[in-house]
């Protein structure tokens, strides 16, 4: 037989706390134990579950755990079943709730001198005791026209008056604990002698010199007083108006009228209502003066046909916010269609050339109206007026290539030469009409040129070949004055080019023929051995059939080229002594000598007292100093040639003679001693 060693017993439990219903059985064979609640099997949950044979509660729940529990033991082999005694919980709990109006049925029905009943919806077991509070202060029974019915959890105010106004709350406590109202009730019973707002003034925006009206009404018994004040606390009455409110009128119903409003009237107006009792009620409203500023300028817009574009109109700053609309040709744009207004945007869908023109954005408010135009251009692809042509341009003269196109807006033209963009410089210029000017045509300008004409809608291009008509010219022009070395072989070249290869010949300027030792070989004048008589004026003549002839005059000088008779030597001088650098040159014409010291030419007129250049070319430096050290160059030149030679000058300290050295001992290096 199945025997219960421990049976569950009824017990007190606290809401939300742990509990255990014990059950232990003894049986000859294996049994399984389960629990019933009000006759229905109990399913294990995280909150309520079997713990061995006992039933454990992690948190007692007054709703789910109310009822009769029974422990059942069953032998599944024999089918024998035993049931324990019934057990239940006496669950102690308390739960917060709101303070609600029980009587009258609605807040709107609360009047002075009526009975008002409030109910505290805090529940619990055992039944809690209640405490009421107004504005946080406890209320005791029978005090100040109110009764507390603890049994009914009610607070009755009999009769209710203004002195009962406030925030009502309740708290309750029992053996389980304490709870306070989750939502409180504000009782507002107007004192008829207190001022109450009937009509509050609103902010107003008016145009300059227009009128503004503020409405303000209070009610009370007896009737309340009403006063208007402007910003600086100046009272406004029909008898005493401040200087800046001369045109103010206060009506019997409390409204304030301001006529011919000026900027100084803008600001805050206060309407103050005062009842026989209670605090004053202050209502504020602001008078704004309407204003509207200028609109920002639009940049002209260029659109392409077929596209969809938008132009945003930014309303000007203003009060109130200005409304915005678009017009075209004096007609307000619709809100739908192909060209329409959406909000403050002008929308052009599938743009056509005919949409081009001036569109006007208007903005307006109480202060006035502003407008701003935007010029819309519908771009077209350029078309040809004159394409560039293959051209023959004369060398040395200006050359022109046309690229004349038309489009809206005016197309931009760029030129390419051999696929390279031509940037305008001293030789190339692109005119406003697209024509390219080459200021002085050169032979290498003969190539391909391409012009491209563009607008935002697209571009066109064409190319042309330039052939340069070469002029008859010397290449290079012979030097007009040349020298030949006496008694030596000499050549004077002359070459030319032209549209046809020119023939070149030399002749003496006086027309006389060339001596037999002088030959003219394809433009090169050759002197086998130069004589004095070969000096003089010669002319090189280049000619061809189509271009005629050109002449170049050359004056030939026969000279004995420069040689140095005496060259300066490496020289070392004691500081304070005199240095002599010798230099003598010969040649025909007689050469002139110049000196260069330390990388600058020594100007004989600016040498100063220490330096001097002799007639024969020698350079003398007196009282030498260390800074005179350096390389000195002797330059000899005449009209035919120039030669130079150089030597270093060293300036050293004079050594102090040693005892062993005799007075006649030679210095350790070559010196000039003076």
């Amino acid at each position: 037989a199945i025997v219960f060693i421990k049976q569950p017993s009824s017990q007190d439990a606290l809401q939300g706390r742990r509990a255990l219903l014990r059950c232990e059985v003894e049986a000859p064979g294996p049994v399984h134990v389960y629990w019933l609640l009000d006759g229905a099997p109990v399913q294990d949950t995280e909150r309520r579950f079997a713990q061995g044979s006992s039933l454990s509660f992690a948190a007692v729940d007054r709703l789910q755990d109310s009822g009769t529990f029974q422990c059942v033991a069953r032998d599944d082999v024999t089918g024998e079943e035993a049931r324990s005694a019934n057990a239940s919980f006496n669950i102690k709990w308390i739960e917060a709730g709101p303070v609600v109006l029980k009587h009258p049925a609605s807040e709107a029905e609360i009047q002075p001198q009526t009975q008002v009943t409030l109910r505290c919806h805090i529940d619990g077991h055992p039944r809690p005791t209640y405490q009421w509070f107004r504005d946080g202060t406890p209320l005791s029974d029978g005090q100040s026209n109110h009764t507390v019915s603890s049994k009914e959890r009610n607070l009755t105010l009999r009769p209710a008056g203004p002195e009962h106004s406030g925030l009502y709350s309740c708290c309750a406590h029992s053996a389980f604990g304490q709870a306070c109202s989750s939502q409180n009730f504000t009782l507002s019973i107007a004192d008829e002698s207190f001022a109450r707002v009937v009509l509050a003034p609103q902010d107003v925006v008016v145009a300059r010199y227009e009128e503004a009206m503020f409405h303000c009404q209070f009610s009370a018994q007896p009737p309340p007083s009403l006063q208007w004040l402007f910003e600086d606390e100046t009272p406004i009455t029909n008898r005493s108006r401040p200087p800046h409110l001369r045109r103010a009128t206060v009506f019997a119903n409390g409204s304030l009228l301001l006529t011919q409003v000026r900027p100084r009237n803008a600001g805050i107006y206060r309407c103050i209502g005062q009842g026989q009792r209670g605090p004053p009620i202050i209502l504020e409203a602001t008078l704004h003066l309407a204003e509207i500023e200028d609109m920002p300028l639009f940049e002209p817009r260029v659109f392409t046909a077929g596209s969809e574009e938008r132009v945003t109109c930014l309303p000007p700053k203003g009060l109130p916010e200005p409304s915005v609309w678009w017009e075209h040709a004096g007609v307000r744009l619709p809100t739908h269609g192909r060209v329409y207004q959406k909000g403050h945007e002008l929308v052009l869908a599938n743009i056509a050339e005919s949409d081009a023109g001036v569109y006007t954005c208007h903005a307006a408010n109480l202060a006035g109206q502003r407008r701003q135009d935007v010029n819309i251009t519908v771009a077209t692809v350029p078309s040809w007026l004159k394409k560039p042509q293959d051209s023959q341009l004369e060398e040395g003269k200006p050359g022109y290539l046309d690229c004349l196109t038309q489009a809206t807006p005016k197309p931009t033209v760029v030129w390419y030469r051999n696929q390279m963009l031509i940037s305008e410089d001293s030789r190339f210029e692109v005119f406003k009409n697209g024509t390219l000017r080459i200021n002085s045509v050169e032979v290498y300008d003969g190539t391909w040129y391409r012009c491209m004409s563009s607008t935002p809608a697209g571009s066109i291009e064409a190319q042309a070949r330039v052939q340069v008509l070469e002029k008859l010219k010397f290449t290079p022009p012979p030097q007009p004055q040349q020298c030949m070395e006496f008694d030596k072989e000499a050549t004077v070249p002359c070459s030319a080019t032209g549209r046809e290869k020119p023939t070149i010949k030399w002749e003496r300027a006086d027309g006389s023929s060339l001596p037999e030792w002088v030959t003219d070989n394809a433009g090169t004048l050759h002197f086998a051995r130069v004589t004095r008589d070969d000096a003089g004026n010669y002319t090189c003549i280049a000619s061809n059939g189509p271009q005629g002839q050109i002449r170049a005059h050359v004056q030939l000088t026969v000279a004995v080229f420069i040689t140095f008779k005496v060259e300066p030597e490496r020289t070392t001088v004691y500081q304070g002594h005199t240095a002599l650098l010798q230099c003598e040159a010969q040649g025909d014409p007689k050469p002139l000598i110049q000196w260069k010291g330390k990388d600058r030419i020594l100007d004989p007129t600016k040498l100063g007292p220490r330096m001097h250049i002799f007639q024969n070319g020698s350079l003398v430096i007196h009282d030498v100093a260390p800074e005179d050290s350096g390389r000195y160059t002797c330059i000899a030149g005449n009209s035919c040639n120039i030669k130079h030679t150089e030597a270093p000058l060293y300036v050293v300290d004079k050594p102090v003679p040693e005892e062993s050295e005799g007075p006649g001992s030679p210095p350790p290096y070559k010196m000039i001693q003076t």
Epitope: P296, F298, E299, R301, R310, T312, L314, P315, P316, K317, E321, S323, T335, K342, G343, H344, E345
Partner: antibody, heavy 116, light 107 residues
């Protein structure tokens, strides 16, 4: 006084959708465009799209086509943005904004967190 | 889409300094260029619209300039309250686009 009041923060799971709102007050609602802007944490601003409150016409940034859907309720002066097929990349602050020259107003932003 | 390139991406300056932020668009904007300031708390405020018009209530130390594709925002004398991130935004061609932002810090 112009105000744009946006709905509160949202925490949603990847793959789900969310609808955030922006209530306008204090200006003529029906003749304005309302814009939506996205800002990922520590990043810049991205324009999502806009809706014309008069007729519900919309323009979207191509990047957000299919992701965002803008609608408006004229009677309550409220605009909505629905974001669908949410991923972690959609976690951001979303602003509604009315741009009109000097009359420029932004909502306070709605934080969307997409997390499993 | 129009690309907006904002430089520098961050800068640190001393109080009283003159600060300039640049914005370059990939195509002309016809002056439809706005500058916004975003405070560290996330609030966004318009400073300049239509390239150079100062938004109501914005201090006059902020100025905007530029045309075509190149625009700039200058703060003539930097103040502590100017810290934040600055964005340029074009309103010429849909979709509207923003610059990457310039974070301004005080040295």
């Amino acid at each position: 006084q112009v105000q744009l009041q946006q709905s509160g923060p949202e925490l949603v799971k990847p793959g789900a959708s969310v609808k955030i709102s922006c209530k306008a007050s204090g200006y003529p609602f029906s003749t304005s465009w309302m814009n939506w802007v996205k800002q990922r944490p520590g990043k810049g601003l991205e324009w999502i799209g806009r809706i014309y409150l008069g007729d519900g016409d919309t323009n979207y940034n191509g990047k957000f086509t299919g992701k965002a859907t803008l609608t408006a309720d004229k009677s309550s002066s409220t605009v909505y943005m629905q974001l669908s097929s949410l991923t972690s990349e959609d976690s951001a602050v979303y602003f509604c904004a009315r741009w009109r020259g000097d009359y420029d107003y932004w909502g306070q932003g709605t934080t969307l967190t997409v997390s499993s | 889409d129009i690309q907006m390139t904002q430089t520098p991406s961050s800068l640190s300056a001393s109080l009283g300094d003159r600060v300039t932020i640049n914005c370059r668009a990939s195509q002309g904007l016809s002056n439809y260029l706005n500058w916004y300031q975003q405070k560290p708390d996330g609030t966004v405020k318009l400073l300049i619209y239509y390239a150079s018009i100062l938004h109501s209530g914005v201090p006059s130390r902020f100025t905007g300039s530029g045309s075509g594709t190149d625009y700039s925002l200058t703060i003539s004398t930097l103040e502590q309250e100017d810290i934040g991130t600055y964005f340029c935004q074009q309103g010429n061609t849909l979709p509207w686009t923003f610059g990457g932002g310039t974070k301004l810090e005080i040295k």
